[in-house]
């Protein structure tokens, strides 16, 4: 069977890395397990992996924006950053605004590795499934 | 054969949703067929599904920005909006603006499943074939 | 073996089209040769290509950004820009700005095409591995 | 910058036909609509109908169908309203005006044409 | 068809006092994602010109003393601080369906 993910997002986030919606709506999940905000990786391979974060705020300040996609394994002391996105200057000053950050890249991925989103202000993050999702399919 | 498909912009379009230009240029169809500004499933399966927008205008006035992928099928009573990206307060007031919207995921498509892109204003968008396009692949 | 390749920003790239690290960190080459900035295709078929580019700078002065990806063939006199994304008015003038530019799709590719990925501003792209990247697989 | 540059006034007999053009300039005239709007003398404001020069498409308000032609020159990106067997309550300011296609609103506006009506 | 319905036809008000204009639509003119109502200022002799759209956004080069508010079949449409180059006729107008229509205007005047 494939192995395939996609989350959506999950409004009762609190806490980073962001956790997902893994089992209603437009959710996918097969051959791949998640676990407290993350994807578990069970066979090693090449994988596609994906994030997009819809962040919006009701007065624009410009406070700068971050969404990683990076990668935990017991093996490795510390986290690998694979992909990133920073927004600064994005808005006009008081006014409502809306952006989207999108990352998609492959990688060759090992049994029990982890991968996790991570934004850089909760707050203004939008858990729309359609909107702010993380997903990954083995080529 | 692999079922593809890789759309690009046709300018002359007044409709919604947007139509796509699918015979000249770089364009791929296989195993897909295109109706009417839809893709066409023939075949239940993962696919990625993708598409670029390319949002411009003379003189900003930052009207809000939508780009939607969506679903229809005759089983369901309402369109299910698979991914989208919105956009406010992205450019300074009277300037020349250019912008472009990404989206791209995995999803469970079904036999029949019609697949169409949507934006919220027509009068923006830029239609060359690199920079507004439409695609998607059988995993 | 599959035909994969995932490329990382290079600082010392001086002119386009980009350089990219091929050897170390998250990098990917396996079916697909590189060669002075570019990725040869050494068996035609089905391609999803893609590639960020982050843009930055200390203040912002709303210069236009753009980001292709294209593809040349001794066969052909021109290069065919394959994936664009361009901005304009993205920043407040005078500030410290940071935006991303991510472009992804499908294409028939052909054996001793070369590909390459080109930006209008040299000096304002940030070549973190994270953040700036080409890649493609073979479907 | 955006303009909409419109014929000058017309005096016309009951069942005659007039056609007022407006002239583009400063934009893409094929990527918006140009809309059609009259307005009595101390009256409000009426749509008549939109043209789409991309493609010539185009669609009337009920109360012009028939009378009222839409029709556009891309080569001089140019308007044309065209309205026939002509009437005493016809005798009105007519607008030409840039329309977002999907939006709808009239963000730029012509210097409007004065058509009477009279015997 | 929407009817638009203007109130009042007339309103005086002395210049720096707020002004309040409504719209009412005979059925309701949003979606999910936007509110399909604009509103325009014209003076006499020259053409409307757009303030806001889709009901609550200001057009380029229009004062931030211009704000329009409201969602399904009631609009609202305030100038915070009345200036004397703002006493004029101001119309709403959806675009819903067709056809567009127009309110029948509301003429601001000097009290």
């Known amino acids: 069977l494939r192995k395939v993910a996609h989350l959506t997002g999950k409004s009762n986030s609190r806490s980073m890395p962001l956790e997902w919606e893994d089992t209603y709506g437009i959710v996918l999940l097969s051959g791949v397990k998640y676990k407290k905000g993350g994807l578990v990786i069970n066979e090693t391979g090449l994988y596609f992996v994906y994030s997009k974060v819809y962040f919006r705020g009701q007065s624009c300040n410009n406070l700068p924006l971050s969404h990683k996609v990076y990668m935990r394994n017991s093996k490795y002391p510390q986290d690998l950053v694979m992909m990133e996105g920073k927004m600064m200057s994005y808005c006009t000053t008081g006014q409502m605004w809306a952006r989207s950050s999108y990352l998609g890249a492959v990688f060759n991925l090992t049994s029990a590795d982890h991968l996790y989103v991570n934004v850089s202000e909760l707050s203004l993050v939008n858990f729309e499934e359609s909107q702010t999702f993380f997903g990954l399919y083995k080529l | 054969l692999r079922k593809v498909a890789h759309l690009t912009g046709k300018s002359n379009s007044r409709s919604m949703p947007l139509e796509w230009e699918d015979t000249y240029g770089i364009v791929l169809l296989s195993g897909v067929k295109y109706k009417k500004g839809g893709l066409v499933i023939n075949e239940t399966g993962l696919y990625f599904v993708y598409s670029k927008v390319y949002f411009r205008g003379q003189s900003c006035n930052n009207l809000p920005l939508s780009h939607k992928v969506y679903m229809r099928n005759s089983k369901y009573p309402q369109d299910l909006v698979m991914m989208e990206g919105k956009m406010m307060s992205y450019c300074t007031t009277g300037q020349m603006w250019a912008r472009s919207s990404y989206l791209g995921a995995v999803f469970n498509l079904t036999s029949a499943d019609h697949l169409y892109v949507n934006v919220s204003e027509l009068s923006l968008v830029n239609f060359e074939e690199s920079q507004t396009f439409f695609g998607l692949y059988k995993l | 073996l599959r035909k994969v390749a995932h490329l990382t920003g290079k600082s010392n790239s001086r002119s386009m089209p980009l350089e990219w690290e091929d050897t170390y960190g998250i990098v990917l080459l396996s079916g697909v040769k590189y060669k002075k900035g570019g990725l040869v295709i050494n068996e035609t078929g089905l391609y999803f290509v893609y590639s960020k580019v982050y843009f930055r700078g200390q203040s912002c002065n709303n210069l236009p950004l753009s980001h292709k990806v294209y593809m040349r063939n001794s066969k052909y006199p021109q290069d065919l820009v394959m994936m664009e994304g361009k901005m304009m008015s993205y920043c407040t003038t005078g500030q410290m700005w940071a935006r991303s530019s991510y472009l992804g799709a499908v294409f028939n590719l052909t054996s001793a095409d070369h590909l390459y990925v080109n930006v209008s501003e040299l000096s304002l792209v940030n070549f973190e591995e994270s953040q700036t990247f080409f890649g493609l697989y073979k479907l | 910058q955006v303009q909409l540059v419109q014929s000058g006034a017309e005096v016309k007999k009951p069942g005659s036909s007039v056609k007022v053009s407006c002239k583009a300039s400063?934009?893409?005239?094929?990527?918006?609509?140009i809309s059609w709007v009259r307005q009595a003398p101390g009256q409000g404001l009426e749509w008549m109908g939109w043209i789409f020069p991309g493609d010539g498409s185009s669609q009337y308000n009920e109360n012009f169908k028939g009378r009222a032609t839409l029709t556009t020159d891309k080569s001089t990106s140019t308007a044309y309203m065209e309205l026939s067997s002509l009437r005493s309550e016809d005798t009105a300011v007519y607008f030409c005006a840039r329309s977002l296609i999907s939006t709808a609103m009239f963000d730029h506006w012509g210097q409007g044409t004065l058509v009477t009506v009279s015997s | 068809e929407i009817v638009m319905t203007q109130s009042p036809a007339t309103l005086s008000v002395s210049p720096g006092e707020r002004a309040t204009l409504s719209c009412r639509a005979s059925?309701?003119?949003?979606?999910?994602?936007?509110?399909?109502i604009h509103w325009y200022q014209q003076k006499p002799g020259q053409a409307p010109r757009l303030l806001i759209y889709l009901a609550s956004h200001l057009e380029s080069g229009i004062p931030a003393r211009f704000s329009g508010s409201g969602s399904g079949t009631e609009f609202t449409l305030t100038i915070s601080s009345l200036q004397s180059e703002d006493f004029a006729v101001y119309y709403c107008?959806?675009?819903?369906?067709?056809?567009?229509?127009f309110g029948q205007g509301t003429k601001v005047e000097i009290k």
């Open positions: 059925k309701s003119v949003s979606t999910s994602d936007f509110s399909y």
């Open positions: 400063g934009y893409t005239f094929t990527r918006f609509d």
């Open positions: 107008q959806h675009s819903r369906e067709l056809p567009r229509t």
